[in-house]
């Protein structure tokens, strides 16, 4: 960077090299070049010569003034015009940064994804700081009072093996950068209450084509959690409004959910689960698309035969991994 050059003098910034965005700043350049009484001192920002707001302070020093500086990063250097020198002589350079102090971290959330072996803690960092900001996650056992600290730039994964102080903890986050430091509220957690079941995945769909076509969605999770509540949401790809179906689920069974949908329409399905009564949900599963077949001509019989709902042609969509062969395309 610009800071690695050999200097023949010195450049500095007031109030500081890292400062609050929107401040007025002064950049000073002082030449110390052998056998040179500078005729003129020049400032460059990101390689472009500055032409205004330059004041000569004395024989060797000049000041460049910026009002309301809004650039997150800039490389500054200054040069001198020396008598008998054809080219400008480099004096020194400095990288400067502007940004904001951190906001108070909020929405601190810690979850344990089943089988992951980690407690994952995240938070809302607030507005962009533009400068290097570090976070210290404090985890304090409510049983042993022992506190552990973890340094990170974003979220943190903490091995559950390292949480030896029982089940109850306080978690809080400190955010710090060159412009300030803030601390979140404390989050109280119980390790048994923050487990998110193994991901639920829709594997396939079939529509039994009859007077009222019935679509069966097959889905599963590898969870070992006994009491799991799930939601499946679905909508026509042309619609904005999701319909949501709720379940208390026993994964010792293969899950199959029946829907009576409109014919000849492309639908999208997603599922998510949580341990029953707990706070945190899985993220919604990958989008699963399924198009219902065109309707069979209506049979104008007096009594609608219920078993015709369960007979006839079958139209299927099958998942390959997360996305399906029928899973391409955008949601309208």
């Amino acid at each position: 960077g610009i800071t690695n050059i050999n200097c023949s003098g010195h450049i500095w910034v007031e109030p500081a090299t890292i400062f609050k965005m929107g401040m007025n700043i002064s950049i000073y350049c002082q030449a110390a070049i052998k056998n040179c009484q500078p005729r003129k001192l020049h400032f460059y920002k990101n390689g472009i010569k500055e032409r205004f707001q330059i004041t000569r302070i004395n024989k060797t020093t000049a000041r460049l003034w910026y009002k309301n500086f809004l650039e997150p990063h800039a490389s500054m250097y200054c040069t001198a015009e020396c008598p008998k020198h054809f080219q400008e002589t480099l004096i020194c350079g400095k990288d400067i940064s502007s940004g904001y102090p951190p906001d108070i971290p909020d929405e601190v959330t810690c979850v344990i994804y089943e089988y992951s072996g980690n407690m994952t803690c995240t938070w809302n960092a607030g507005k962009l700081t533009y400068i290097d900001t570090k976070y210290v996650v404090h985890v304090k056992s409510l049983e042993t009072e022992e506190e552990q600290q973890y340094l990170t730039s974003s979220y943190i994964n903490i091995s559950t093996d390292s949480l030896q102080g029982g089940k109850k903890y306080l978690v809080w986050v400190q955010a710090a950068n060159a412009l300030g430091m803030e601390e979140s509220k404390q989050l109280q957690i119980h390790l048994d209450d923050i487990v998110i079941p193994s991901a639920a995945v829709i594997s396939r769909a079939e529509t039994i084509n009859a007077t009222v076509p019935k679509t069966i969605i097959y889905w599963d999770s590898q969870t070992t959690i006994e009491k799991v509540s799930c939601e499946m949401r679905y909508k026509a790809t042309t619609n904005q409004t999701w319909n949501v179906k709720e379940f208390d689920t026993n994964f010792t069974y293969v899950q199959q959910s029946e829907f009576y949908l409109e014919p000849n329409i492309k639908y999208v399905f997603q599922v998510r689960c949580q341990e029953t009564g707990k706070r945190y949900w899985q993220p919604w599963s990958s989008l699963f698309f399924h198009k219902t077949p065109e309707t069979v001509p209506q049979v104008t019989s007096k009594a609608f035969q219920h078993d015709t709902w369960n007979s006839g042609l079958t139209v299927a969509s099958i998942s390959t991994g997360h996305l399906t062969s029928d899973n391409r395309g955008d949601i309208g």
Partner: antibody, heavy 117, light 107 residues
Framework: EVKLVESGGGLVQPGGSLKLSCAAS????????MSWVRQTPEKRLELVAE????????YHIDTVKGRFTISRDNAKNTLYLQMSSLKSEDTAMYYC??????????WGQGTTVTVSA | DIVMTQSHRFMSTSVGERVSITCKAS??????VAWYQQKPGQSPKLLIY???TRHNGVPDRFTGSGSGTDFTLTISNVQGEDLADYFC?????????FGSGTKLEIK
Amino acid sequence: EVKLVESGGGLVQPGGSLKLSCAASGFTFSSDTMSWVRQTPEKRLELVAEISSNGGSTYHIDTVKGRFTISRDNAKNTLYLQMSSLKSEDTAMYYCASPGYPWFAYWGQGTTVTVSA
Amino acid sequence: DIVMTQSHRFMSTSVGERVSITCKASQDVGNAVAWYQQKPGQSPKLLIYWTSTRHNGVPDRFTGSGSGTDFTLTISNVQGEDLADYFCQQYNRYPLTFGSGTKLEIK
């Protein structure tokens, strides 16, 4: 012809229990979600509980959670609702309905549950 | 919970007339609405689902319309046998909820 026949209703004291049954015929019972829907004396309709075709998932409204349990026996083509810790506000006509989601195309004739001291 | 409001508890009409029964959802339910008819002393019967699709065997004088929050069941050429309570139901979100019903009286 689709037929749903409920039984097991009656007069019970608050805190008591009842088990409702619904015998289904005329369709492939084992391949549809089934529900219990109740209608209060004021004629309000309310979905009480729902069970998927293979019994792998269920839904109960919050007011009955922990007190009522829906179950099914596909071999016997029968739907059940086990009701315990009954309250006066559970007094209603209980209907067995098919399919149990998203709407109810077929209803039984209903069985009356009266919770009173 | 989504509240389904049927503002008219009673509606009166004559044979051969056209009547519209309305239902308002407390939030957007898309087109996930069904309508039921319940005649005195009988169980409810499904008339309409997905807002406007008639259930098998339902006469075409029954039509459903609407979307979002406002829904209507229209009976054209009302017949004497249409004397009943009519209920709307949303299945967009759990708990699935019903309107309180509109009693259609024939003059």
